[in-house]
């Protein structure tokens, strides 16, 4: 999917409300310091597509963060904002659905929403300090 | 561990190639703008080319223009630097580096391969 | 090109704040980032956008960046800090890194 054309604004509002809540909720316990920035994006449609893919595509260390309520969320963010995103997640959304595990936040999960933590923050500073 | 590796140096003769390689591991390779650095020896640190993270841009010192490319393969993990028409003065130790960009700028440099040694002599 | 220009060498009692200059026309008005370099080893960043530190670097390393010079300042210097120091912008009218010419630091 092609990021280029959501309501950046209206993202950046509704993470700011309330997925980076439910984000910061998951990490509890974890400084921010303890992972390494892994993953980057260089603008707004480039973050969403890498926050895309960390949130909902299992990895084998890390396969349950799309149930948690943080990707629910994003889901509905993206859903609401970006024209066609919703019909375009209908066949992923269906493939999940076939391979549940069962939820165990492990420590491979947590460096992996801190990576989205990243992703986000990257997202919403629409530009470095100066330059 | 992210880490990255640079392989290839040696010793060429004046106009002759040679061509770096550097392989990323333990980060999102195609997440990251990816530059050059070189150093001879004795001296401060020079910046070679940079690559975009989609491999889309690239821009290069004017001293190397023309004569090297800076390429990605991001399905590998791997940089490239192809140097033609070597001189005396690329003698150097060469490094890669990540760097995160946004839009067009490019952050710091934070993490670095161990560096390859490229003479150039006859 | 835009150029960056450090003190040749710099030298710290152990114990006491060393400080190092970076010069640059309006260089306060981008971005700063200073990396350390030991004999036979890489460069490894030790600040970033003007004063920010990465987690790895102890808190005795810190930058500021005005005017026309940044400065990277280490207090409470210790023999394991000996080392080159280079600043270092991106600069986006000409789309180039500059790199200043290093300071070697010497602790006494």
């Known amino acids: 999917y092609d990021f280029t054309n959501c309501d950046f604004q209206k993202i950046e509002a509704d993470y700011l409300r309330t997925i980076s809540k439910d984000l910061i909720t998951y990490m509890s316990g974890t400084k921010s310091t303890d992972f390494n920035n892994t993953v980057s994006c260089s603008n707004r449609p480039h973050c969403l597509t890498e926050i895309q893919s960390l949130t909902f595509n299992p990895t084998p260390r890390c396969a349950s963060l799309a149930k948690e309520m943080f990707a629910r969320k994003t889901k509905a963010t993206l859903a609401l904002w970006c024209p066609g995103y919703s019909e375009t997640q209908i066949n992923a959304t269906q493939a999940m659905k076939k391979r549940r595990k069962r939820k165990v936040t492990t420590n491979k999960c947590l460096e992996q929403v801190s990576q989205l933590l990243g992703l986000w923050r990257r997202f919403i500073r629409t530009l470095l300090k100066k330059q | 561990q992210m880490q990255l590796v640079e392989s290839g140096g040696g010793v060429v003769q004046p106009g002759r190639s040679l061509r770096l390689s550097c392989a990323a591991s333990g980060f999102t390779f195609r997440t990251y703008g990816m530059h050059w650095v070189r150093q001879a020896p004795g001296k401060g640190l020079e910046w070679v080319a940079v690559i975009w993270y989609d491999g889309s841009y690239t821009h290069y010192a004017d001293s190397v223009k023309g004569r090297f490319t800076i390429t990605r393969d991001n399905s590998k993990n791997t940089l490239n630097l192809q140097m033609n028409s070597l001189r005396a003065e690329d003698t150097a130790v060469y490094y890669c580096a990540r760097s995160p960009q946004w839009e067009d700028i490019f952050e710091a440099f934070d993490i670095w391969g161990q560096g390859t040694m490229v003479t150039v002599s006859s | 090109s835009y150029v960056l220009t450090q003190p040749p060498s710099v030298s710290v009692a152990p114990g006491q704040t060393a400080r190092i200059t970076c010069g640059g026309n309006n260089i306060g008005s981008k971005s700063v980032h200073w990396y350390q370099q030991k004999p036979g080893q890489a460069p490894v960043l030790v600040v970033y956008?003007?004063?920010d530190r990465p987690s790895w670097i102890p808190e005795r390393f810190s930058g500021s960046n005005s005017g026309n010079t940044a400065t990277l300042t280490i207090s409470r210097g210790e023999a394991g800090d000996e080392a080159d120091y280079y600043c270092q912008v991106w600069d986006s009218s000409s789309s180039l890194v500059v790199f200043g010419g290093g300071t070697k630091l010497t602790v006494l």
């Open positions: 956008d003007d004063s």
